[in-house]
């Protein structure tokens, strides 16, 4: 999916809003320090493509976030400010509901969390340059 | 332009009724949501209730439950709040809001229908004063 066509302002308000929230709620108990950030990004739609990669496919060691309430909240933002994104969704949801596993929060887990904690804000600073 | 201009505010005693419209022009009503907001002094604002003009889809807050009803006439452009069995805490200013997006995605609306920044189109609001 291309992101360019999506409404950023809206979307960058919806996680201001609470999705932001729901990432901290997730990583509570971890320090801020713990992991590194090795992902990154460099403009809103190649953010964004970032942030649903890592949020929506599974990793080594990290099988599924996506019934994780942040991840509920990012698919449903992106459903409605990125016209089409809903359609090309469809054979992902159905393939991942074939796969899905119980719900286990691991170090792993974690640290990809983090990672998208680090997306999200360079999506929320897109004129910053790139380091 | 788009406007949004609400009314039907005013005082009533607590157990009592009100009916708010808000009469929105500007812009294609069958694909926006629309919600109430309401703003008590010293307060944030909060979402009240949910439309969407697409399907008829509502959201309510769990403090307004049971007591208000949300409802819309595209016809006429216009929505409504019928409030029943008002209480002296929902003294407030009463604003309308639009969306150009949610309208047309109901169900996923529900993580964010109560968040004020979501919003493209405001109305001036109307004074709603329950008196114990």
């Known amino acids: 999916y291309d992101f360019t066509n999506c409404d950023f302002e809206k979307i960058k308000a919806a996680y201001l809003s609470t999705i932001s929230k729901d990432l901290i709620t997730y990583m509570s108990g971890t320090k801020s320090t713990e992991f590194n950030n090795t992902v990154s990004c460099s403009n809103r739609p190649h953010c964004l493509t970032e942030i649903q990669s890592l949020t929506f496919n599974p990793t080594a060691g990290c099988a599924s976030l996506a019934k994780e309430m942040f991840a509920m909240k990012t698919k449903a933002a992106l459903a409605i400010w990125c016209p089409g994104y809903s359609e090309t969704q469809i054979n992902a949801t159905q393939a991942m509901k074939k796969r899905r596993k119980r719900k286990v929060t691991t170090n792993k887990c974690l640290e990809q969390v983090s990672q998208l904690q680090g997306l999200w804000r360079r999506f929320n600073r897109p004129l910053l340059k790139q380091q | 332009q788009v406007q949004l201009v609400e009314s039907g505010g005013g005082l009533v005693q607590a157990g009592g009724s009100l009916r708010l419209s808000c009469a929105a022009s500007g812009f294609t009503f069958d694909d926006y949501a629309i919600t109430w907001f309401r703003q008590a002094p010293g307060k944030e604002r909060e979402g009240v209730s949910y439309?969407?003009?697409?399907?008829?889809?509502?959201y309510y807050a769990d403090s307004v439950k049971g007591r208000f009803t949300i409802s819309s006439d595209n016809a006429k452009n216009t929505v409504y709040l019928q409030m029943d069995s008002l209480k002296p805490e929902d003294t407030a200013v009463y604003y309308c809001?639009?969306?150009?997006?949610?309208?047309?995605?109901?169900?996923?609306?529900?993580?964010?229908?109560?968040?004020?920044?979501?919003?493209?189109?405001w109305g001036q609001g109307t004074q709603v004063t329950v008196s114990s």
């Open positions: 809001a639009a969306e150009g997006r949610m309208g047309t995605h109901s169900r996923e609306s529900s993580y964010f229908w109560t968040f004020p920044a979501l919003y493209d189109y």
């Open positions: 439309i969407s003009n697409n399907d008829h889809n509502t």
